[in-house]
Each structure stands twice: as structure tokens, then as C-alpha cells.
């Protein structure tokens, strides 16, 4: 008949499993339960995947690994206390009197329940990495954490290479024994110990459970250290940078931590497993029963097969590891799970020209000299598209791409952003907003939804802010509907008249040149260069200013560059920026200074793109450590990451305007990095490429 083979990870667990099997058999519970001995949770997962065992209870981190690497699914969950159900919450606690926030944890003293523990280590460290606050080079999480905090107590870190920093705040027992032990010998061990570390002023932040503060304050704790503590003297750090009362843990936490769950192979019937265990818990979970499913006391251990604090087992409806873990915990695990043994020794960078090969070679040497990991290798390709193909084919690992190329890399080749460039505000030519500018006119005001029949001014055919984005956006929003992919005709029919300067006017609709004026002599009308006075962003704005058009599609800087005395040409000399407004996608109008909130799209910064199976945190970790050494254009370390002048080129490997590489944070897909408006505009245009 059918049998379920439970995997036990130790002798005591094997003992308890044997007793459970016997108890179930005597009670006539079907299918029969057998026990298989594994050496660890990891080993058991491998046995289950290999069909040599069927089930095991795992914690969140192990469920993530089992699901991601071996395709196992959670089918039965543990419940601990009725208030929170099948989860608890990992929180960061600080003294109310301090000024610490989630964004200022660098350099503060930290208290942890123990090394590799869920709320004390895995969640906070994973969250800090995943959110881009903590960069990790070469998977060396311990080093990254020891460099990040200004001293810590992480019980159990004494055996690591970074014990000086990670055990600095630990104090051992009253006689100084057991310093940094992962046991009650260390006074700052476990939930209450980590909180005590904060309460006694040793640390500035404690990573604990949602209930820890309330269980150890307001007279609820017996030990003398907690007698006088008041819960109101502590606050929680929220992910958005704010702080909250300790009772607000449902809204203000680092992650909801899923309960332990029973996992099985994808082809195993989860309902069957639950029926088996449900019969068992009905008979063997209350005091006085011959076998205790949720107690490990008889075996001299804790949490054997199930957590001792389990009050009941429940079926899991959506049997995927992602759904069970939840996005907060899932994200934290992504940041944490980096196996140095599985880290590729090289990061192969895609290069597109001889100068870029030279700069990449120098970068590889400079990084190696500083022992940065992984090492850089340089691999040539013929074009950005060729890079994408080679990355997808696993012949190369990374390349820096522009907005349109990021779109192609993501949509066609499945690549994802691993790091981004950030430019100084003065460098508006590298990343800018596309805006629709109109005259401030209360009597004839119209919105973005009412552009049909208006007169339009464009920098030129094919210009990003003057044509591609606005036309793409209007197509995507359904206002312009090209027939047979004829965008030009559709635009010419949508607007009453336009000026869209062009280099090759063959078969060009006349209405797209109707507003153009040419040069001072009236020649060169509608040409795609500065002989046409309405050419370019300045010209498109002039077209609006001189009342030729009703709307100008330009960059967010254009109005400022040509008003308030910033342009002394006669047509612009007396213009005031307050006489113009922006049309917003939501139908409103806004001041020209509100471009960040009221625009058609932002032309995004360049990003480093990689395969989705590449660990993006190791890529950013490498670039972040590298930019500390080589990011400043005046550094004396022998290489300049963001400068190409030594190679007689421009924008090699990275744009020269880059002031720093940034983590992608939540923008982990090409759509996230590019922004929905920019993607929509590109899709609007690409939908017309027949």
C-alpha cells in the first residue's frame, strides 16, 4: 500500500519519528508512516528530490532553498499562536530617545539573537542587502556585516574570522564566561538577550520578534535587568524610514516570517499529507495522549519533527514556496542566500570597441590588485544586441545598457538589472524627464486628454523627448491609432498642425511641417537642423512661445533654459517660467518645477544587465567596493571607473557622467528600472514596427 517516508535529521528525531510511526500505525492512520534517516535538513531535501524520502518540516530559509533549487512545495503549515496565525514578524527595535532609522543603521551598534537565526540575522541582513543598504562583495556576508555595523553582539559568531567586530558587544555570563556563545551562557543570546543588549545601552538596535519588547517590559519580566523597562521607551524601525510604536508591528516590520511547513515533491498529493497529519494531531496533540506530536521533552531535545510551540497543523492552499514565504521574506532570502562555493570566480564583462577593451583590461587588473571578487574578464561583442545574445547564451555575464537597449534586453532576452548609474543633477542630458509644455491660459486651458486637434511642436522626428516618448505615449493611451502601422499619417491626423523637423522628408505628411518657419529668410523650412528655427528642444519651445503651437514636447530643463533671463536671444529674453505649465498624465496641469511628478516619462539612467540566475547582489557588491577605490575621477588608485579620457573614447563601460553606481532596490526587472511610462511609450512605438 501507499506509504509516506518522513526524513529525520538526527538520532533523537529518528527516535521520535519511530514513535510517531508506531502511534499512527496503532491508531490505524493511513497511509503508513515510515522514517528515513538523513544527515541534515539539506540532505533530506536532496533525498526527497531523489524520491528516496517524501516529507520533512523546514523553516523559511530551507523552504526557500528547497523550492528554488529542488522544486519542492509546502503543503502543511504550523500554527503557533492564534493572534498571528501561521507567521510571526521580524522587527528592528531602537530606544525612543535615539535618532536611528532604517536608513542610518550604518555605523550603529547592533544586537542579534544569534548567528544564522531567522529574525536576529537572516531577515535583517537579507533585508539590508536586498534593499541595497548593505553591499556584499564575494558572498562574504560576515565581513559585510562586520564592516557595516559599529560593533555587534551576534552569539555564535566567535568561530568566524570577524569575531572581533561581531562579538564586540557580547558579555557572557555574570562571571564573564561564554562570551558570544550561541547559548544562554551569553546574556545577550536569544530574543530576550538581544533586547537586553539594547535596553542596557550596549547596542543601538536589536533585531528581534514582534512580541519580544512587550514580553520583556512593563513588569512582565522576572530578571532584574528588565524590571524597570517601559515598552513606551522603545520604537520600531519601519522599512520606509519612519518609526512606530512597538505595538504597531503589523504595519512596521522588516518581514513577516512564515511558519515552518512540511514540504514534499511537486508530484506528491498535498491533501494526502495533510489528512495523515491531521488524523495524527487529532489524536496525539493534547496532554495525556500516549504520543505527543508537538513535544520533544521525552527525547531531551527541542523542536523535533515539528516546533514544540505548534498549536495545530493546517493545510496550505496555494502550494508554492513563494506564496507561503510571502514577498517580504522572499526578498530578504534573496539578499542573504549567497553561497561562496557557488560564486563564479569571474564576472565576464561585454565590451564593444578597442578603447573599451583597453579600459576593461585595466579595470580587471585594478580590481585584481585590490583583491576584489569576482574577478573581471573582458569579452568582445559586435553590438549591444550581440552582448544580449551572448549573455543569454551564458558566454558573457554583464553589460551596461541604455534605456532602449534595457527594454530589448529584458523583453527579448530575459535579462534583469543588477546595478544602475546615478548622475549629478547638472547632467540632465543623461537622464531627464519628457514633458508636455503649454501656455498658462485659464480661458482656453486643456489637458493631456484633449490634445486632439491642437497644434504641436516637436524637437524633431525620432528625438526621444520630441517624438518617440510623446507619440508612443499617445499611441499607448489609445489617443493616436495608426492604421497599417502608418504612425506619421496618424500623428498628422491627430494634431491640427505640427512642426516636426525631419532629415528625409520623402512621403512626409505636409501637416507635420505646417508650423515650421525655416531660417530668417524663410528657407530650409522643416529641415532637421538648426537652420529651422523651431528645430530641437529650444526650437520646439520657441514654436510654443511664438504662438505657432499649443503644446511643445521637450525636456524638463527646456523651459528653464529659455526663461527668466537664461537665454538672451530676442524671442526668449523677456519670458518668465511661471507663464508656462506642464500637462500631467492624470489630466491635471502643474507648475514647470513639478516635472518629477508631472511628466510623460523619465529617460532612465543606464543599468548593468545580467541573466536572471546571476546573483545581482554580488555584482552590485563588487561595483560598490570598486567605486570606493576607483569611482572618484581624482582618485590616486590607478584607475578611473567613470572616466574614459585616458582611452580616447567616451562612456566606455560606464557613462562618464556617472557619479556612483546604485543598487536597483525594488526595480529588479527591466520594467521596474525603466518605469511604466517609459515602457508604455516604447511599447506604443514598437507596436507600430511592422
Amino acid at each position: 500500500g501507499m506509504e509516506v517516508r518522513w526524513c529525520a535529521t538526527s538520532d533523537p528525531e529518528q527516535h521520535k519519528c519511530g514513535n510517531m510511526s508506531e502511534a499512527f500505525r496503532e491508531a490505524g492512520i493511513q497511509p503508513s508512516l515510515l522514517c528515513v534517516r538523513g544527515t541534515s535538513a539539506d540532505h533530506c531535501v536532496q533525498l526527497i528530490a531523489a524520491q528516496e524520502a517524501d516529507a520533512i518540516t523546514l523553516d523559511g530559509g530551507a523552504i526557500y532553498e528547497a523550492g528554488k533549487e529542488h522544486g519542492l512545495k509546502p503543503v502543511v503549515g504550523e500554527v503557533y499562536d492564534q493572534e498571528v496565525g501561521t507567521s510571526y514578524y521580524a522587527v528592528a527595535v531602537v530606544r525612543r530617545s535615539s535618532h536611528v532609522t532604517i536608513d542610518t543603521l550604518k555605523g550603529v551598534k547592533s544586537c542579534h539573537t544569534g548567528i544564522n537565526r531567522t529574525v536576529g540575522w537572516n531577515v535583517p541582513v537579507g533585508y539590508l542587502v536586498e534593499s541595497g543598504r548593505l553591499s556584499v562583495m564575494g558572498c562574504d556576508v560576515l565581513k559585510a556585516v562586520s564592516d557595516y555595523f559599529g560593533g555587534s553582539c551576534v552569539p555564535g559568531a566567535g568561530e568566524t574570522s570577524y569575531s572581533e567586530s561581531l562579538c564586540r558587544l557580547c558579555r557572557g555570563d555574570s562571571s564573564g564566561e561564554g562570551v558570544c556563545d550561541k547559548s544562554p551562557l551569553e546574556r545577550y543570546y536569544d530574543y530576550s538577550g538581544a533586547f537586553r543588549c539594547l535596553a542596557e545601552g550596549a547596542g543601538d538596535v536589536a533585531f528581534v520578534k514582534h512580541s519580544t519588547v512587550l514580553e520583556n517590559t512593563d513588569g512582565k519580566t522576572l530578571p532584574s535587568w528588565g524590571q524597570a523597562l517601559l515598552s513606551q521607551d522603545f520604537e520600531l524601525l519601519c522599512r520606509d524610514g519612519s518609526r512606530a510604536d512597538v505595538t504597531e508591528w503589523r504595519q512596521c516590520h522588516l518581514a513577516r516570517v512564515p511558519a515552518h511547513a512540511v514540504v514534499v515533491r511537486a508530484d506528491t498529493d498535498g491533501g494526502l499529507i495533510f489528512r495523515l497529519l491531521n488524523e495524527g494531531q487529532r489524536l496525539f496533540s493534547h496532554e495525556g495522549s500516549s504520543f505527543q506530536m508537538f513535544s520533544s521533552e521525552a527525547y531531551g531535545q527541542k523542536d523535533l519533527l515539528f516546533k514544540d510551540s505548534t498549536s495545530e497543523l493546517v493545510p496550505i492552499a496555494t502550494q508554492t514556496y513563494e506564496a507561503w514565504l510571502g514577498h517580504e521574506y522572499l526578498h530578504a532570502m534573496k539578499g542573504l542566500l549567497c553561497d561562496p562555493n557557488r560564486l563564479p570566480p569571474y564576472l565576464r564583462w561585454c565590451v564593444l570597441s578597442t578603447p573599451e577593451i583597453q579600459k576593461c583590461g585595466d579595470m580587471a587588473v585594478a580590481f585584481r590588485r585590490q583583491r576584489l571578487k569576482p574577478e573581471i574578464q573582458c569579452v568582445s561583442a559586435k553590438s549591444p544586441q550581440h552582448c544580449m545574445e551572448r549573455i543569454q547564451a551564458e558566454q558573457v555575464d554583464a553589460v551596461t545598457l541604455s534605456g532602449e537597449d534595457i527594454y530589448t534586453a529584458g523583453k527579448t532576452y530575459g535579462l534583469v538589472p543588477a546595478a544602475g548609474e546615478h548622475y549629478a543633477p547638472e547632467d540632465s542630458s543623461n537622464s531627464y524627464y519628457v514633458v508636455a509644455v503649454v501656455r498658462r491660459d485659464s480661458s482656453h486651458a486643456f489637458t493631456l486628454d484633449e490634445l486632439r486637434g491642437k497644434r504641436s511642436c516637436h524637437a524633431g522626428f525620432g528625438s526621444p523627448a520630441g517624438w518617440d516618448v510623446p507619440v508612443g505615449a499617445l499611441i499607448q493611451r489609445g489617443f493616436i491609432r495608426p492604421k497599417d502601422c502608418d504612425v506619421l499619417t496618424a500623428v498628422s491626423e491627430f494634431f491640427n498642425a505640427s512642426c516636426v523637423p525631419v532629415n528625409n522628408p520623402k512621403n512626409y505628411p505636409s501637416s507635420l511641417c505646417a508650423l515650421c518657419v525655416g531660417d530668417e529668410q524663410g528657407r530650409n523650412k522643416c529641415v532637421g537642423n538648426s537652420q529651422e528655427r523651431y528645430y530641437g528642444y529650444r526650437g520646439a519651445f520657441r514654436c510654443l512661445v511664438e504662438n505657432a503651437g499649443d503644446v511643445a514636447f521637450v525636456r524638463h530643463t527646456t523651459v528653464f533654459d529659455n526663461t527668466n533671463g537664461h537665454n538672451s536671444e530676442p524671442w526668449a529674453a523677456e519670458l518668465r517660467s511661471e507663464d508656462y505649465e506642464l500637462l500631467c498624465p492624470n489630466g491635471a496641469r502643474a507648475e514647470v518645477s513639478q516635472f518629477a511628478a508631472c511628466n510623460l516619462a523619465q529617460i532612465p539612467p543606464h543599468a548593468v544587465m545580467v541573466r536572471p540566475d546571476t546573483n545581482i547582489f554580488t555584482v552590485y557588491g563588487l561595483l560598490d567596493k570598486a567605486q570606493d577605490l576607483f569611482g572618484d575621477d581624482h582618485n590616486k588608485n590607478g584607475f578611473k571607473m567613470f572616466d574614459s579620457s585616458n582611452y580616447h573614447g567616451q562612456d566606455l563601460l560606464f557613462k562618464d557622467a556617472t557619479v556612483r553606481a546604485v543598487p536597483v532596490g525594488e526595480k529588479t526587472t527591466y520594467r521596474g528600472w525603466l518605469g511604466l511610462d517609459y515602457v508604455a511609450a516604447l511599447e506604443g512605438m514598437s507596436s507600430q514596427q511592422c
Epitope: 546615478h422 549629478a424 543633477p425 547638472e426 547632467d427 540632465s428 542630458s429 524638463h556 530643463t557 528653464f560 533654459d561 527668466n564 537664461h566 517660467s577 518645477s593 513639478q594 516635472f595 518629477a596 511628478a597 575621477d633 557622467a657 557619479v659 546604485v662
Partner: antibody, heavy 119, light 112 residues
Framework: QVQLQESGPGLVKPSETLSLTCTVS????????WNWIRQPPGKGLEYIGY???????YYNPSLKSRVTISRDTSKNQYSLKLSSVTAADTAVYYC?????????????WGQGTLVTVSS | DFVMTQSPLSLPVTLGQPASISCRAS???????????LHWYQQRPGQSPRLLIY???NRFSGVPDRFSGSGSGTDFTLKISRVEAEDVGVYYC?????????FGQGTKLEIK
Amino acid sequence: QVQLQESGPGLVKPSETLSLTCTVSGDSITSGYWNWIRQPPGKGLEYIGYISDSGITYYNPSLKSRVTISRDTSKNQYSLKLSSVTAADTAVYYCARRTLATYYAMDYWGQGTLVTVSS
Amino acid sequence: DFVMTQSPLSLPVTLGQPASISCRASQSLVQSDGNTYLHWYQQRPGQSPRLLIYRVSNRFSGVPDRFSGSGSGTDFTLKISRVEAEDVGVYYCSQSTHVPPTFGQGTKLEIK
């Protein structure tokens, strides 16, 4: 009218962390760039860094390893932390705004707060 | 690093007379967008700096028209057509074309 106001302790011990907050009124810190500058007694101005409208930070490389700038948009405040201070960090610390309207010149400044590093 | 050099460092001026301060950058301040991000600040005694001129020659709101700025590339000048008593203080040029933004060492204007 845009106003910026620095606040924080006037005395910090060597090796400790200097913490200052800039409270902004008359504008939102979710637009523009929000900066810290310092001026040692009797000396010139030194740029420390900024936090952008989207929350991205940039730090002067000479101070980068010790600086953190963060913000609390709900309070319209941004903060400076400078760790491991020495007597050389004694200065008047200013917060200031930069926007496109003045081509990212620092158009509005706080009144400054003197921070002395001494044991 | 990127250096801004002002001269003179001290400038005694008679009330009602003109004054001129020079500022030289160690590299061109013309940005790729064509703009020159060179600004001038005034710091009166005991006060915080105040923006006078931005982008070489644009007066900030509320700044008297006796102040003017000029220059291009690497050489820039701040002129005061007729010095008044309230103009006493230190004047700084500053660039933000290159990161980090840097300041000149300051020119102290005093009344003769």
C-alpha cells in the same frame, strides 16, 4: 518662503558620531536636491553631500567612508551622520537646497549650527 | 581635486567705488549640455552664505542689480558697480559642473 533649520547637539566627543537634522518648510524634500555643507571656524566652505528627490545619496569622496545622509519624508526632514569624528570635524554645518530653477546652485541655506568635537 | 582659485583674497574698497573679484577653475566648467555651472555666494559676518549669482551671470531673486557676473570656460568675474556698507563679507565662487561641488577659498571684501 522656503526655510531650512539645522538641529542637533553642539558638542560631540572624539570617535563618536555627529548627528544633525535639517527641517524644511515651504518646499517638499521629494523634489530637488538636499545638501550638507560645512565650514570650519575661520575657514572656507566644504561640500559634504546630498540626498536626491528619489532618495539617492552622493557623498564627497573625502568624507564618503564616514558619512550617511538620510531622510524622513513624513516629517519633511533630512539628516546627516558623520562617524568617528575628530577635532578636524569641528565646524559650522549648513543644510541647503539645490533645484533646477537656479541651475542647482544652493539657493536656500539654513542658519548653520556649530558642532564642536572635544572630550 | 578640482580647484577653484579666487583673487584677491582680500579686497579693501572705498564706499561707492566698484569692486571686482576673479575666479579661475582648474578645468573648463562647460557641461555637456552647454551650461556653465558657476555660482557666486556672499557670506556676511556671522551669517550663512547667500546665493548672489547662478550660472555665471544670472542674479538670484532679491539681489541688487549692482552685482553682476561674467566669464566663460575657466575664468570668471564678479563685479559690484558701487560698493555699499552692507556688501561687507566674504565672497565665494563655486562650481557644480564637476563632482563634488567645490568652492573658492573666498575673497574678503572690507571698506577702506
